[in-house]
Amino acid sequence: VLHYVVCFPALTEGYVGALHENRHGSAVQIRRRKASGDPYWAYSGAYGPEHWVTSSVSCGGRHQSPIDILDQYARVGEEYQELQLDGFDNESSNKTWMKNTGKTVAILLKDDYFVSGAGLPGRFKAEKVEFHWGHSNGSAGSEHSINGRRFPVEMQIFFYNPDDFDSFQTAISENRIIGAMAIFFQVSPRDNSALDPIIHGLKGVVHHEKETFLDPFVLRDLLPASLGSYYRYTGSLTTPPCSEIVEWIVFRRPVPISYHQLEAFYSIFTTEQQDHVKSVEYLRNNFRPQQRLHDRVVSKSAVRDSWNHDMTDFLENPLGTEASKVCSSPPIHMKVQPLNQTALQVSWSQPETIYHPPIMNYMISYSWTKNEDEKEKTFTKDSDKDLKATISHVSPDSLYLFRVQAVCRNDMRSDFSQTMLFQANTTRI
């Protein structure tokens, strides 16, 4: 008879920690309970963005970020002239470090970088850099967008006014104005060597709470070549507490990044909490859904000649955009449960982001190993509503791996879901 089952998500090899090595060489961490602490939040699930307001009331405010910027409705603001950057051309010192916070990868800046102009009320000092990205293949990962077009990565640089506050954290805790720059990364065929120190750093912070010192880099080289075309609006932090204190500068032109370099972002892990248990998962799609503009106006810079080149050079290039790659983010919330001694039920939830709706059906693939033989089957679930499938004739002494993929209208596919392993152990009673 079926005595007990073990069911857990499969991770990639080489995770350091409390791992069980399965026979396919995948490393798996058994889920652990969350320790109590600060209000927990996540980018999906029970602690996802729609629930942030329960612990951070500002997240329900009317001046939230990020937003979609519609260029034709942005009005030129004569006060938004050239940015003055100071220290951005210097190489960073060896004290600059990177940390995997579990929600993003942050660069903690230890040198003096100052920005003024662009309507900022004073001379602001750069404190940190954070990144937001998608799930794979250059899929949409930016928080802001222009005319509905999102980018694979958004880099955000946060600033505070050192004349008013002794630290960035003080400015936030006192709900005072901070500045933020948003820089889009767009896929290009070649590596961007300016990003090499960042990409190298990412490989040192693959796991949650890891930290590493960064090789020297030039912050100016991480910004667009032309800084003259930017948008300005007043918004919020894009993570709890969502304080509405941010003067946003969103650069229209992107910075190039290769697919190869993007992979470093997609290889980052986090620790997620769902149903009172923790699991190690990839940190992907770490962006907040876009917020309503309400009564705000988006302005655009008045820098002479900066808007002359049309956006078509990057906005209409399908290379690397989600449109050319995958139809949705992966199906989520994979579960495998025994129905009886010879049948299993696989269930999942629809992808969180669908780039090319609608999803027409789902492909369920499962493989198993018995007597050193590996077999695989795939079948289609013709539904966008009933997201479960029954697997019959399950062998009780085999290890099963399940994964699900969405199929969209244009026959494009999503990425595969997290792979679930299922082991049914048999014991004579």
């Epitope: 059906n361 539904s383 966008d384 509503k385 244009n410």
Partner: antibody
């Protein structure tokens, strides 16, 4: 605000090709799919077809080559050889982007095509 | 191809609750949407994904689904609710695709 408007509807004789145009405002046609829907006088809504952001098209089973959807900066519906049964108000509608199902949340006011000899 | 079946007409007294149905085998596995169309106007999306209401749609309108039937319920019917109501859904595979409207229900509010 985002909006769509149809034009090109008029009285035509059977067999005379006619192209209707859907002009959009504030909508990025490389991101959104646009459908054409028609409604004969006193009858219900009838989906004709859709063109998505990448330019792929799908048509209702009954269309069978009678209509062609294309786009540039506008979305066009060509009625290749109109018959009297094609007399209807033709609507252009924007699909809701990013939803798990397809819904039309922005519609134009419609343009009337009358096919008569 | 499949057909969504709706009653041709339904009457409701002012202030009462009325339910409009839409039936098709495909609705057991596909989500339904509901549109309202008043004479001489374009349709307006009322309900999507069986139960969800777009912003701006009064909460008197609600959707539900069970088995192969989707239902639009209007509670506290008002004179302004007099209109044609269409259910709709999509179906197909990755390479084929259809969007289908029901025949529509003409709602008359009396009293």
């Amino acid at each position: 605000a985002q909006s769509v408007e149809e034009s090109g509807g008029r009285l035509v004789t059977p067999g005379t090709p006619l192209t209707l145009t859907c002009t959009v405002s504030g909508i990025d046609l490389s991101s959104y799919a646009m459908s054409w829907v028609r409604q004969a006088p006193g009858k219900g809504l009838e989906w004709i077809g859709v063109i998505d952001g990448s330019g792929s098209t799908w048509y209702a089973n009954w269309v069978k080559g009678r209509f062609t959807i294309s786009k540039t900066t506008t979305v066009d519906l060509k009625i290749t050889s109109p018959t009297t049964e094609d007399t209807a108000t033709y609507f252009c509608a924007r699909e809701d982007y990013g939803s798990e199902t397809i819904d039309f949340n922005i519609w134009g006011p419609g343009t009337l095509v009358t096919v008569s000899s | 191809s499949f057909v969504l079946t709706q009653p041709a007409s339904v009457q409701v007294n002012l202030g009462q609750t009325v339910s409009l149905t839409c039936t098709a085998d495909t609705l057991s596995r596909r989500y339904a949407s509901w549109y309202q169309q008043k004479p001489g106007q374009a349709p307006v999306l009322l309900i999507y994904r069986d139960t969800r209401r777009p912003s701006g749609v009064p909460d008197r309108f609600s959707g539900s689904s069970s088995g192969n039937t989707a239902t639009l319920t209007i509670s506290g019917a008002q004179a302004g609710d007099e209109a044609d109501y269409y259910c709709a859904t999509s179906d197909g595979s990755g390479s084929s695709y259809q969007y289908v409207f029901g025949g529509g229900t003409q709602l008359t509010v009396t009293g």
